[in-house]
Protein backbone atom coordinates (compact mmCIF):
# COMPACT_ATOMS: atom_id res chain seq x y z
CA UNK A 1 0.00 0.00 0.00
CA UNK A 2 1.61 3.17 -1.30
CA UNK A 3 2.73 6.28 0.22
CA UNK A 4 2.40 5.82 3.96
CA UNK A 5 5.02 8.32 4.90
CA UNK A 6 7.43 8.72 7.71
CA UNK A 7 7.35 12.13 9.29
CA UNK A 8 10.79 13.25 10.37
CA UNK A 9 9.84 16.90 10.18
CA UNK A 10 6.41 16.93 11.79
CA UNK A 11 5.85 18.60 15.11
CA UNK A 12 2.90 19.66 17.18
CA UNK A 13 2.30 23.16 18.43
CA UNK A 14 4.93 24.32 20.94
CA UNK A 15 2.67 23.98 23.98
CA UNK A 16 1.61 20.47 23.09
CA UNK A 17 5.17 19.52 22.23
CA UNK A 18 6.46 20.69 25.59
CA UNK A 19 3.59 18.99 27.39
CA UNK A 20 4.47 15.70 25.75
CA UNK A 21 7.87 15.84 27.41
CA UNK A 22 9.42 14.26 24.33
CA UNK A 23 12.41 15.45 22.39
CA UNK A 24 11.39 13.33 19.42
CA UNK A 25 8.66 14.12 16.89
CA UNK A 26 5.67 11.80 17.05
CA UNK A 27 6.00 8.53 15.15
CA UNK A 28 4.41 8.02 11.78
CA UNK A 29 0.80 6.88 12.07
CA UNK A 30 -0.17 3.44 10.86
CA UNK A 31 -2.18 3.07 7.68
CA UNK A 32 -5.12 0.64 7.43
CA UNK A 33 -4.24 -2.43 5.41
CA UNK A 34 -6.73 -1.75 2.61
CA UNK A 35 -5.81 1.92 2.27
CA UNK A 36 -3.17 4.23 0.87
CA UNK A 37 -2.10 7.00 3.20
CA UNK A 38 -0.13 10.20 2.78
CA UNK A 39 0.42 12.22 5.90
CA UNK A 40 1.98 15.00 3.87
CA UNK A 41 -1.28 15.29 1.94
CA UNK A 42 -3.42 14.44 5.00
CA UNK A 43 -5.23 12.00 2.76
CA UNK A 44 -6.35 8.41 3.14
CA UNK A 45 -7.71 6.52 0.14
CA UNK A 46 -9.48 3.20 0.66
CA UNK A 47 -10.82 2.82 -2.85
CA UNK A 48 -12.33 -0.23 -4.59
CA UNK A 49 -11.21 -2.60 -1.85
CA UNK A 50 -14.52 -4.37 -1.13
CA UNK A 51 -14.59 -3.02 2.42
CA UNK A 52 -17.68 -3.98 4.39
CA UNK A 53 -17.20 -1.34 7.08
CA UNK A 54 -15.20 1.78 7.84
CA UNK A 55 -11.64 0.82 8.84
CA UNK A 56 -11.11 1.06 12.58
CA UNK A 57 -7.52 2.30 12.57
CA UNK A 58 -7.78 5.50 10.56
CA UNK A 59 -4.86 7.85 11.27
CA UNK A 60 -5.88 10.95 13.25
CA UNK A 61 -4.18 13.33 10.79
CA UNK A 62 -6.69 12.51 8.04
CA UNK A 63 -8.45 15.46 6.38
CA UNK A 64 -9.47 13.83 3.11
CA UNK A 65 -10.97 10.37 3.44
CA UNK A 66 -11.96 8.50 0.28
CA UNK A 67 -13.97 5.34 0.97
CA UNK A 68 -15.35 4.95 -2.53
CA UNK A 69 -16.33 1.89 -4.52
CA UNK A 70 -16.55 -0.51 -1.59
CA UNK A 71 -19.26 -2.89 -0.34
CA UNK A 72 -20.63 -1.11 2.72
CA UNK A 73 -24.40 -1.48 2.98
CA UNK A 74 -25.05 0.15 6.37
CA UNK A 75 -23.41 3.14 7.99
CA UNK A 76 -24.16 2.77 11.71
CA UNK A 77 -24.32 5.44 14.39
CA UNK A 78 -20.83 6.64 15.28
CA UNK A 79 -19.26 4.98 12.24
CA UNK A 80 -16.39 7.47 12.47
CA UNK A 81 -16.15 7.82 16.26
CA UNK A 82 -12.56 7.22 17.25
CA UNK A 83 -10.29 7.83 20.23
CA UNK A 84 -8.74 10.30 19.75
CA UNK A 85 -11.46 11.71 17.48
CA UNK A 86 -10.86 12.38 13.80
CA UNK A 87 -10.94 16.08 14.60
CA UNK A 88 -9.28 17.19 11.36
CA UNK A 89 -11.47 15.23 8.95
CA UNK A 90 -12.87 17.84 6.55
CA UNK A 91 -13.92 15.91 3.47
CA UNK A 92 -15.48 12.47 3.42
CA UNK A 93 -16.28 10.70 0.15
CA UNK A 94 -18.49 7.62 0.48
CA UNK A 95 -19.73 7.58 -3.10
CA UNK A 96 -20.24 4.42 -5.08
CA UNK A 97 -20.66 1.99 -2.22
CA UNK A 98 -23.77 -0.12 -1.77
CA UNK A 99 -25.11 1.91 1.13
CA UNK A 100 -28.78 1.27 1.72
CA UNK A 101 -29.01 2.63 5.23
CA UNK A 102 -27.44 5.64 6.93
CA UNK A 103 -28.33 5.61 10.60
CA UNK A 104 -28.95 8.48 12.99
CA UNK A 105 -25.66 9.92 14.20
CA UNK A 106 -23.59 8.19 11.51
CA UNK A 107 -21.37 11.28 11.25
CA UNK A 108 -21.19 12.21 14.92
CA UNK A 109 -17.77 12.98 16.44
CA UNK A 110 -16.52 14.61 13.23
CA UNK A 111 -16.39 18.23 14.40
CA UNK A 112 -14.59 19.50 11.29
CA UNK A 113 -16.57 17.68 8.59
CA UNK A 114 -17.27 20.27 5.90
CA UNK A 115 -17.92 18.18 2.81
CA UNK A 116 -19.74 14.87 2.56
CA UNK A 117 -20.40 12.89 -0.62
CA UNK A 118 -22.90 10.04 -0.46
CA UNK A 119 -23.58 9.95 -4.19
CA UNK A 120 -24.30 6.76 -6.12
CA UNK A 121 -25.62 4.81 -3.16
CA UNK A 122 -29.14 3.29 -3.26
CA UNK A 123 -30.42 4.80 -0.02
CA UNK A 124 -33.64 3.13 1.03
CA UNK A 125 -33.27 4.31 4.61
CA UNK A 126 -31.67 7.67 5.21
CA UNK A 127 -32.38 8.49 8.83
CA UNK A 128 -34.02 11.82 9.50
CA UNK A 129 -31.19 12.32 11.99
CA UNK A 130 -28.32 11.14 9.80
CA UNK A 131 -26.90 14.67 9.68
CA UNK A 132 -28.47 16.13 12.83
CA UNK A 133 -27.10 13.53 15.20
CA UNK A 134 -29.96 13.91 17.69
CA UNK A 135 -33.72 14.05 17.62
CA UNK A 136 -33.90 17.39 19.40
CA UNK A 137 -36.19 19.92 17.70
CA UNK A 138 -33.18 22.21 17.38
CA UNK A 139 -29.92 20.27 17.40
CA UNK A 140 -26.37 21.54 17.50
CA UNK A 141 -25.39 22.88 14.08
CA UNK A 142 -23.66 20.42 11.81
CA UNK A 143 -20.29 21.65 10.50
CA UNK A 144 -21.31 20.51 7.01
CA UNK A 145 -20.97 23.13 4.29
CA UNK A 146 -21.27 20.90 1.23
CA UNK A 147 -23.53 17.87 0.91
CA UNK A 148 -23.38 15.82 -2.28
CA UNK A 149 -26.35 13.49 -2.75
CA UNK A 150 -26.36 12.80 -6.50
CA UNK A 151 -28.06 9.59 -7.61
CA UNK A 152 -28.97 8.25 -4.20
CA UNK A 153 -32.37 7.04 -5.40
CA UNK A 154 -32.75 3.26 -5.05
CA UNK A 155 -33.77 1.19 -8.06
CA UNK A 156 -37.52 1.08 -8.62
CA UNK A 157 -37.90 -2.44 -7.27
CA UNK A 158 -36.27 -1.39 -3.96
CA UNK A 159 -38.55 1.59 -3.32
CA UNK A 160 -41.37 1.35 -0.81
CA UNK A 161 -44.95 0.95 -2.07
CA UNK A 162 -44.27 0.73 -5.77
CA UNK A 163 -43.26 3.46 -8.12
CA UNK A 164 -45.11 6.74 -7.63
CA UNK A 165 -45.79 6.31 -3.91
CA UNK A 166 -42.24 5.08 -3.50
CA UNK A 167 -40.90 8.22 -5.12
CA UNK A 168 -43.02 10.40 -2.85
CA UNK A 169 -41.70 8.46 0.14
CA UNK A 170 -38.12 8.82 -1.11
CA UNK A 171 -38.44 12.56 -1.59
CA UNK A 172 -39.99 12.88 1.85
CA UNK A 173 -37.17 10.86 3.40
CA UNK A 174 -34.55 13.13 1.87
CA UNK A 175 -36.47 16.24 2.90
CA UNK A 176 -36.72 15.00 6.49
CA UNK A 177 -32.97 14.44 6.69
CA UNK A 178 -32.27 17.92 5.30
CA UNK A 179 -34.57 19.76 7.69
CA UNK A 180 -34.23 17.85 10.95
CA UNK A 181 -33.20 19.89 13.94
CA UNK A 182 -32.16 22.84 11.79
CA UNK A 183 -28.78 21.10 11.81
CA UNK A 184 -27.83 22.05 8.26
CA UNK A 185 -28.28 25.78 8.68
CA UNK A 186 -24.65 26.31 7.66
CA UNK A 187 -24.94 24.30 4.43
CA UNK A 188 -23.84 26.33 1.40
CA UNK A 189 -23.87 23.68 -1.32
CA UNK A 190 -26.40 20.92 -1.91
CA UNK A 191 -26.33 18.56 -4.88
CA UNK A 192 -29.40 16.41 -5.52
CA UNK A 193 -28.95 15.59 -9.20
CA UNK A 194 -30.21 12.41 -10.88
CA UNK A 195 -32.67 11.35 -8.19
CA UNK A 196 -35.87 11.00 -10.23
CA UNK A 197 -37.55 13.70 -8.11
CA UNK A 198 -41.05 14.33 -9.43
CA UNK A 199 -41.62 17.36 -7.23
CA UNK A 200 -39.87 19.32 -4.51
CA UNK A 201 -41.42 18.80 -1.11
CA UNK A 202 -42.65 22.12 0.22
CA UNK A 203 -40.24 22.02 3.17
CA UNK A 204 -37.21 20.56 1.39
CA UNK A 205 -35.34 23.88 1.44
CA UNK A 206 -37.01 25.51 4.41
CA UNK A 207 -34.20 24.93 6.89
CA UNK A 208 -31.23 25.68 4.62
CA UNK A 209 -30.89 29.46 4.93
CA UNK A 210 -27.19 29.59 3.98
CA UNK A 211 -27.52 27.74 0.68
CA UNK A 212 -25.60 29.28 -2.22
CA UNK A 213 -25.55 26.43 -4.71
CA UNK A 214 -28.39 24.01 -5.36
CA UNK A 215 -28.14 21.34 -8.04
CA UNK A 216 -31.37 19.61 -9.07
CA UNK A 217 -30.20 18.63 -12.54
CA UNK A 218 -31.44 15.52 -14.31
CA UNK A 219 -34.49 14.86 -12.17
CA UNK A 220 -38.10 14.50 -13.29
CA UNK A 221 -39.45 17.76 -11.91
CA UNK A 222 -42.66 18.68 -13.68
CA UNK A 223 -43.53 21.74 -11.64
CA UNK A 224 -42.09 24.01 -8.97
CA UNK A 225 -45.50 25.18 -7.79
CA UNK A 226 -45.14 23.85 -4.25
CA UNK A 227 -41.48 24.65 -3.76
CA UNK A 228 -40.45 27.81 -2.00
CA UNK A 229 -37.14 29.53 -2.62
CA UNK A 230 -38.08 32.64 -0.66
CA UNK A 231 -35.88 31.87 2.36
CA UNK A 232 -32.78 31.18 0.27
CA UNK A 233 -31.57 34.75 0.39
CA UNK A 234 -27.94 33.77 -0.32
CA UNK A 235 -28.70 31.53 -3.30
CA UNK A 236 -26.34 32.16 -6.23
CA UNK A 237 -26.76 29.12 -8.50
CA UNK A 238 -29.85 27.01 -9.05
CA UNK A 239 -29.47 24.18 -11.55
CA UNK A 240 -32.69 22.82 -13.02
CA UNK A 241 -31.42 21.57 -16.35
CA UNK A 242 -32.65 18.25 -17.75
CA UNK A 243 -35.92 18.05 -15.85
CA UNK A 244 -39.53 17.81 -17.06
CA UNK A 245 -40.53 21.41 -16.44
CA UNK A 246 -43.37 22.60 -18.69
CA UNK A 247 -43.89 26.16 -17.45
CA UNK A 248 -42.90 28.39 -14.56
CA UNK A 249 -45.64 30.29 -12.78
CA UNK A 250 -45.61 33.85 -11.52
CA UNK A 251 -45.22 32.82 -7.90
CA UNK A 252 -41.90 31.09 -8.66
CA UNK A 253 -40.68 33.87 -10.95
CA UNK A 254 -41.46 36.47 -8.29
CA UNK A 255 -39.50 34.51 -5.70
CA UNK A 256 -36.47 34.32 -7.96
CA UNK A 257 -36.77 38.00 -8.74
CA UNK A 258 -36.52 38.66 -5.01
CA UNK A 259 -33.23 36.80 -4.64
CA UNK A 260 -30.43 39.31 -5.06
CA UNK A 261 -27.66 37.16 -6.55
CA UNK A 262 -29.34 34.12 -8.07
CA UNK A 263 -28.65 32.62 -11.48
CA UNK A 264 -31.06 29.90 -12.61
CA UNK A 265 -30.15 27.34 -15.26
CA UNK A 266 -33.13 25.92 -17.15
CA UNK A 267 -31.79 24.34 -20.31
CA UNK A 268 -33.18 21.11 -21.73
CA UNK A 269 -36.67 21.11 -20.26
CA UNK A 270 -39.80 20.27 -22.36
CA UNK A 271 -41.38 23.73 -22.29
CA UNK A 272 -45.02 23.83 -23.34
CA UNK A 273 -45.58 26.97 -25.37
CA UNK A 274 -49.27 27.59 -24.87
CA UNK A 275 -51.20 30.44 -23.32
CA UNK A 276 -49.95 29.56 -19.83
CA UNK A 277 -46.41 30.35 -20.98
CA UNK A 278 -47.07 34.07 -21.61
CA UNK A 279 -45.97 35.29 -18.18
CA UNK A 280 -42.80 33.23 -18.24
CA UNK A 281 -41.86 34.45 -21.72
CA UNK A 282 -42.40 38.09 -20.71
CA UNK A 283 -40.29 37.54 -17.60
CA UNK A 284 -37.50 35.81 -19.54
CA UNK A 285 -37.25 38.71 -21.95
CA UNK A 286 -36.63 41.13 -19.07
CA UNK A 287 -34.64 39.10 -16.57
CA UNK A 288 -30.90 38.67 -16.07
CA UNK A 289 -31.52 35.71 -13.78
CA UNK A 290 -31.37 33.03 -16.51
CA UNK A 291 -27.96 32.94 -18.24
CA UNK A 292 -28.99 30.21 -20.69
CA UNK A 293 -32.31 31.80 -21.66
CA UNK A 294 -31.38 32.09 -25.34
CA UNK A 295 -31.13 28.29 -25.51
CA UNK A 296 -34.61 27.59 -24.14
CA UNK A 297 -36.92 26.16 -26.79
CA UNK A 298 -40.48 24.86 -27.00
CA UNK A 299 -41.06 21.12 -26.96
CA UNK A 300 -44.85 21.29 -27.36
CA UNK A 301 -47.19 21.75 -29.09
CA UNK A 302 -45.80 20.21 -32.25
CA UNK A 303 -46.20 23.37 -34.32
CA UNK A 304 -44.00 25.28 -31.85
CA UNK A 305 -41.26 22.68 -31.45
CA UNK A 306 -37.71 24.13 -31.38
CA UNK A 307 -38.96 27.73 -31.35
CA UNK A 308 -36.88 29.85 -29.00
CA UNK A 309 -38.82 31.10 -25.99
CA UNK A 310 -37.28 34.54 -26.39
CA UNK A 311 -38.63 34.71 -29.96
CA UNK A 312 -42.24 34.17 -28.97
CA UNK A 313 -44.94 36.85 -28.99
CA UNK A 314 -48.15 36.65 -27.02
CA UNK A 315 -49.99 36.00 -30.27
CA UNK A 316 -47.98 32.77 -30.67
CA UNK A 317 -49.21 31.40 -27.37
CA UNK A 318 -52.67 29.86 -27.53
CA UNK A 319 -54.41 27.03 -25.74
CA UNK A 320 -56.27 25.29 -28.52
CA UNK A 321 -53.64 22.65 -29.15
CA UNK A 322 -54.07 19.17 -27.68
CA UNK A 323 -51.14 18.04 -25.55
CA UNK A 324 -49.85 14.48 -25.39
CA UNK A 325 -51.45 12.56 -22.54
CA UNK A 326 -48.11 12.25 -20.76
CA UNK A 327 -47.84 16.03 -20.48
CA UNK A 328 -51.34 16.76 -19.24
CA UNK A 329 -51.46 17.88 -15.63
CA UNK A 330 -53.66 15.71 -13.46
Amino acid sequence: SAPSSSVPSSSTSPAAFLASGSAQPPPAERCPAACECSEAARTVKCVNRNLLEVPADLPPYVRNLFLTGNQMTVLPAGAFARQPPLADLEALNLSGNHLKEVCAGAFEHLPGLRRLDLSHNPLTNLSAFAFAGSNASVSAPSPLEELILNHIVPPEDQRQNGSFEGMVAFEGMVAAALRSGLALRGLTRLELASNHFLFLPRDLLAQLPSLRYLDLRNNSLVSLTYASFRNLTHLESLHLEDNALKVLHNSTLAEWHGLAHVKVFLDNNPWVCDCYMADMVAWLKETEVVPDKARLTCAFPEKMRNRGLLDLNSSDLDCDAVLPQSLQTS
Epitope: P3, S5, V7, S10, S13, S38, E39, A40, A41, E90
Partner: antibody, heavy 122, light 107 residues
Framework: QVQLQESGPRLVKPSETLSLTCTVS????????WSWIRQPPGKGLEWIGE???????NYNPSLKSRVSISVETSKNHFSLNLSSVTAADTAVYYC????????????????WGQGTLVTVSS | EIVLTQSPATLSLSPGERATLSCRAS??????LAWYQQKPGQAPRLLIY???NRATGIPARFSGSGSGTDFTLTISSLEPEDFAVYYC?????????FGQGTKVEIK
Protein backbone atom coordinates in the same frame (compact mmCIF):
# COMPACT_ATOMS: atom_id res chain seq x y z
CA GLN B 1 -10.36 34.91 -3.80
CA VAL B 2 -7.52 34.65 -1.29
CA GLN B 3 -4.53 36.93 -1.90
CA LEU B 4 -1.15 36.86 -0.15
CA GLN B 5 1.44 39.58 0.27
CA GLU B 6 4.95 39.17 1.70
CA SER B 7 6.63 41.97 3.64
CA GLY B 8 9.80 42.47 5.64
CA PRO B 9 13.43 43.61 5.34
CA ARG B 10 15.02 43.08 1.94
CA LEU B 11 18.57 43.11 3.31
CA VAL B 12 19.79 41.01 6.23
CA LYS B 13 23.30 40.75 7.63
CA PRO B 14 25.04 37.36 7.92
CA SER B 15 24.40 35.53 11.24
CA GLU B 16 21.26 37.60 11.86
CA THR B 17 17.63 36.47 11.68
CA LEU B 18 15.55 36.88 8.55
CA SER B 19 11.97 37.81 9.42
CA LEU B 20 9.10 37.97 6.93
CA THR B 21 5.35 38.34 7.28
CA CYS B 22 2.65 37.18 4.89
CA THR B 23 -0.65 39.04 5.05
CA VAL B 24 -3.75 37.15 3.92
CA SER B 25 -6.66 39.03 2.39
CA UNK B 26 -9.92 37.84 0.88
CA UNK B 27 -10.16 34.89 3.24
CA UNK B 28 -9.61 33.75 6.78
CA UNK B 29 -6.29 32.51 8.07
CA UNK B 30 -8.16 30.22 10.43
CA UNK B 31 -8.64 27.72 7.62
CA UNK B 32 -6.15 26.14 5.20
CA UNK B 33 -2.42 25.64 5.69
CA TRP B 34 0.17 28.33 5.13
CA SER B 35 3.62 27.70 3.68
CA TRP B 36 6.89 29.43 2.95
CA ILE B 37 8.87 28.49 -0.16
CA ARG B 38 12.07 30.05 -1.43
CA GLN B 39 13.96 30.30 -4.70
CA PRO B 40 17.62 31.35 -4.88
CA PRO B 41 18.37 33.56 -7.91
CA GLY B 42 18.38 31.46 -11.09
CA LYS B 43 17.66 28.25 -9.19
CA GLY B 44 14.77 25.99 -8.31
CA LEU B 45 12.14 26.02 -5.57
CA GLU B 46 12.63 24.83 -2.00
CA TRP B 47 9.83 24.29 0.50
CA ILE B 48 10.75 25.78 3.88
CA GLY B 49 7.83 24.79 6.06
CA GLU B 50 4.20 25.31 6.89
CA UNK B 51 1.78 25.99 9.69
CA UNK B 52 -1.72 24.55 9.72
CA UNK B 53 -4.81 26.41 10.87
CA UNK B 54 -4.70 24.29 14.02
CA UNK B 55 -1.17 25.48 14.80
CA UNK B 56 0.75 22.36 13.77
CA UNK B 57 4.06 23.14 12.10
CA ASN B 58 6.09 21.07 9.67
CA TYR B 59 9.57 22.10 8.57
CA ASN B 60 12.02 20.99 5.92
CA PRO B 61 14.62 18.86 7.76
CA SER B 62 17.41 20.73 5.96
CA LEU B 63 16.36 23.97 7.67
CA LYS B 64 14.57 22.73 10.76
CA SER B 65 17.17 23.84 13.31
CA ARG B 66 16.97 27.45 12.07
CA VAL B 67 13.34 27.96 11.08
CA SER B 68 10.20 28.98 12.93
CA ILE B 69 6.76 29.72 11.48
CA SER B 70 3.97 31.28 13.50
CA VAL B 71 0.49 32.59 12.84
CA GLU B 72 -1.30 35.62 14.24
CA THR B 73 -4.97 35.00 13.61
CA SER B 74 -6.15 38.39 14.82
CA LYS B 75 -4.01 40.15 12.21
CA ASN B 76 -4.70 37.54 9.50
CA HIS B 77 -1.02 37.00 8.89
CA PHE B 78 1.68 34.41 9.40
CA SER B 79 5.42 34.84 9.77
CA LEU B 80 8.74 33.23 8.98
CA ASN B 81 11.88 33.51 11.09
CA LEU B 82 15.12 32.04 9.76
CA SER B 83 18.09 32.41 12.09
CA SER B 84 21.84 32.45 11.53
CA VAL B 85 21.55 33.35 7.88
CA THR B 86 24.37 33.16 5.36
CA ALA B 87 24.74 34.24 1.75
CA ALA B 88 23.25 30.86 0.76
CA ASP B 89 19.91 32.05 2.17
CA THR B 90 19.70 34.84 -0.41
CA ALA B 91 16.50 34.07 -2.33
CA VAL B 92 13.08 35.18 -3.36
CA TYR B 93 10.80 34.12 -0.50
CA TYR B 94 7.21 33.22 -1.34
CA CYS B 95 4.29 32.58 0.92
CA UNK B 96 1.57 30.28 -0.35
CA UNK B 97 -1.52 28.51 0.87
CA UNK B 98 -2.46 24.88 0.49
CA UNK B 99 -6.08 24.04 0.77
CA UNK B 100 -9.57 25.28 0.32
CA UNK B 101 -9.95 26.06 -3.37
CA UNK B 102 -11.87 22.88 -4.08
CA UNK B 103 -14.28 21.20 -1.73
CA UNK B 104 -11.84 18.44 -0.96
CA UNK B 105 -8.96 19.40 1.25
CA UNK B 106 -6.38 20.65 -1.18
CA UNK B 107 -2.68 20.19 -0.46
CA UNK B 108 -1.23 22.03 -3.46
CA UNK B 109 0.26 25.51 -3.32
CA UNK B 110 -2.31 27.86 -4.79
CA UNK B 111 -2.31 30.83 -4.71
CA TRP B 112 1.15 32.28 -4.03
CA GLY B 113 2.29 35.71 -2.98
CA GLN B 114 4.29 37.65 -5.56
CA GLY B 115 7.52 37.00 -3.65
CA THR B 116 10.11 39.21 -2.01
CA LEU B 117 13.86 39.09 -2.69
CA VAL B 118 15.88 38.92 0.52
CA THR B 119 19.62 39.48 0.18
CA VAL B 120 22.04 38.34 2.87
CA SER B 121 25.06 40.61 2.80
CA SER B 122 27.14 42.66 5.15
CA GLU C 1 13.41 12.84 0.93
CA ILE C 2 11.90 12.14 -2.46
CA VAL C 3 13.99 13.48 -5.35
CA LEU C 4 12.17 14.60 -8.50
CA THR C 5 14.20 14.63 -11.71
CA GLN C 6 12.85 16.62 -14.63
CA SER C 7 13.88 16.17 -18.24
CA PRO C 8 14.90 17.70 -20.46
CA ALA C 9 16.45 20.68 -18.71
CA THR C 10 15.61 22.84 -21.72
CA LEU C 11 13.12 22.30 -24.52
CA SER C 12 13.42 24.46 -27.64
CA LEU C 13 10.21 24.53 -29.62
CA SER C 14 8.17 26.77 -31.90
CA PRO C 15 4.65 28.06 -31.28
CA GLY C 16 2.09 25.47 -32.35
CA GLU C 17 4.37 22.54 -31.57
CA ARG C 18 3.67 19.90 -28.93
CA ALA C 19 5.70 19.97 -25.71
CA THR C 20 6.27 16.87 -23.60
CA LEU C 21 7.92 17.32 -20.21
CA SER C 22 8.93 14.47 -17.93
CA CYS C 23 9.19 14.18 -14.15
CA ARG C 24 10.56 11.06 -12.46
CA ALA C 25 10.35 10.42 -8.70
CA SER C 26 12.99 8.51 -6.73
CA UNK C 27 10.17 6.46 -5.16
CA UNK C 28 6.43 6.15 -5.69
CA UNK C 29 4.39 9.26 -5.01
CA UNK C 30 1.13 7.63 -6.13
CA UNK C 31 -0.81 10.49 -7.77
CA UNK C 32 0.35 13.18 -5.34
CA LEU C 33 2.11 15.23 -8.00
CA ALA C 34 1.50 18.73 -9.31
CA TRP C 35 2.90 20.88 -12.12
CA TYR C 36 3.55 24.63 -11.89
CA GLN C 37 4.40 27.24 -14.50
CA GLN C 38 6.73 30.13 -13.69
CA LYS C 39 7.45 33.14 -15.87
CA PRO C 40 10.34 35.55 -15.20
CA GLY C 41 9.69 37.84 -12.25
CA GLN C 42 6.47 36.05 -11.31
CA ALA C 43 5.41 33.51 -8.72
CA PRO C 44 4.72 29.95 -9.85
CA ARG C 45 1.17 29.14 -10.90
CA LEU C 46 -0.55 25.81 -10.31
CA LEU C 47 -1.36 24.08 -13.61
CA ILE C 48 -2.05 20.43 -12.83
CA TYR C 49 -2.76 18.75 -9.51
CA UNK C 50 -3.15 15.12 -8.46
CA UNK C 51 -1.15 14.18 -11.57
CA UNK C 52 -3.90 14.78 -14.11
CA ASN C 53 -6.43 17.39 -12.97
CA ARG C 54 -6.31 20.86 -14.50
CA ALA C 55 -6.44 23.70 -11.98
CA THR C 56 -9.15 26.33 -12.28
CA GLY C 57 -8.74 28.54 -15.35
CA ILE C 58 -6.01 26.45 -16.97
CA PRO C 59 -6.52 25.94 -20.73
CA ALA C 60 -7.32 22.48 -22.08
CA ARG C 61 -4.06 22.36 -24.04
CA PHE C 62 -2.32 21.50 -20.75
CA SER C 63 -2.66 17.91 -19.60
CA GLY C 64 -0.94 15.71 -17.07
CA SER C 65 -0.55 11.96 -16.85
CA GLY C 66 1.27 9.31 -14.90
CA SER C 67 1.24 7.60 -11.52
CA GLY C 68 3.83 6.13 -9.20
CA THR C 69 7.22 7.34 -10.34
CA ASP C 70 6.79 8.57 -13.93
CA PHE C 71 4.79 11.64 -14.86
CA THR C 72 4.31 13.73 -17.99
CA LEU C 73 3.09 17.25 -18.63
CA THR C 74 1.91 17.77 -22.21
CA ILE C 75 1.17 21.09 -23.90
CA SER C 76 -0.66 20.06 -27.05
CA SER C 77 0.02 23.20 -29.08
CA LEU C 78 2.33 25.84 -27.68
CA GLU C 79 1.04 29.39 -27.45
CA PRO C 80 3.46 32.33 -27.13
CA GLU C 81 2.50 32.76 -23.47
CA ASP C 82 3.46 29.15 -22.65
CA PHE C 83 7.21 29.73 -22.91
CA ALA C 84 8.29 29.55 -19.28
CA VAL C 85 9.86 27.27 -16.69
CA TYR C 86 7.80 24.28 -15.50
CA TYR C 87 8.26 22.56 -12.14
CA CYS C 88 6.82 19.32 -10.81
CA UNK C 89 6.21 18.90 -7.09
CA UNK C 90 5.28 15.92 -4.92
CA UNK C 91 3.16 15.90 -1.79
CA UNK C 92 3.31 12.21 -0.97
CA UNK C 93 5.99 12.33 1.74
CA UNK C 94 7.60 14.93 3.94
CA UNK C 95 9.10 17.22 2.97
CA UNK C 96 7.25 18.36 -0.17
CA UNK C 97 9.88 18.61 -2.91
CA PHE C 98 10.15 20.20 -6.34
CA GLY C 99 11.93 19.12 -9.48
CA GLN C 100 14.74 21.31 -10.76
CA GLY C 101 12.58 22.65 -13.60
CA THR C 102 12.31 22.42 -17.37
CA LYS C 103 12.68 25.59 -19.40
CA VAL C 104 10.50 25.73 -22.51
CA GLU C 105 12.06 28.31 -24.82
CA ILE C 106 11.27 29.61 -28.28
CA LYS C 107 13.28 27.90 -30.98
Amino acid sequence: QVQLQESGPRLVKPSETLSLTCTVSGGSISSNDWSWIRQPPGKGLEWIGEISYSGITNYNPSLKSRVSISVETSKNHFSLNLSSVTAADTAVYYCATAGGSSGWYDYWFDPWGQGTLVTVSS
Amino acid sequence: EIVLTQSPATLSLSPGERATLSCRASQSVSSYLAWYQQKPGQAPRLLIYDASNRATGIPARFSGSGSGTDFTLTISSLEPEDFAVYYCQQRSNWPPTFGQGTKVEIK
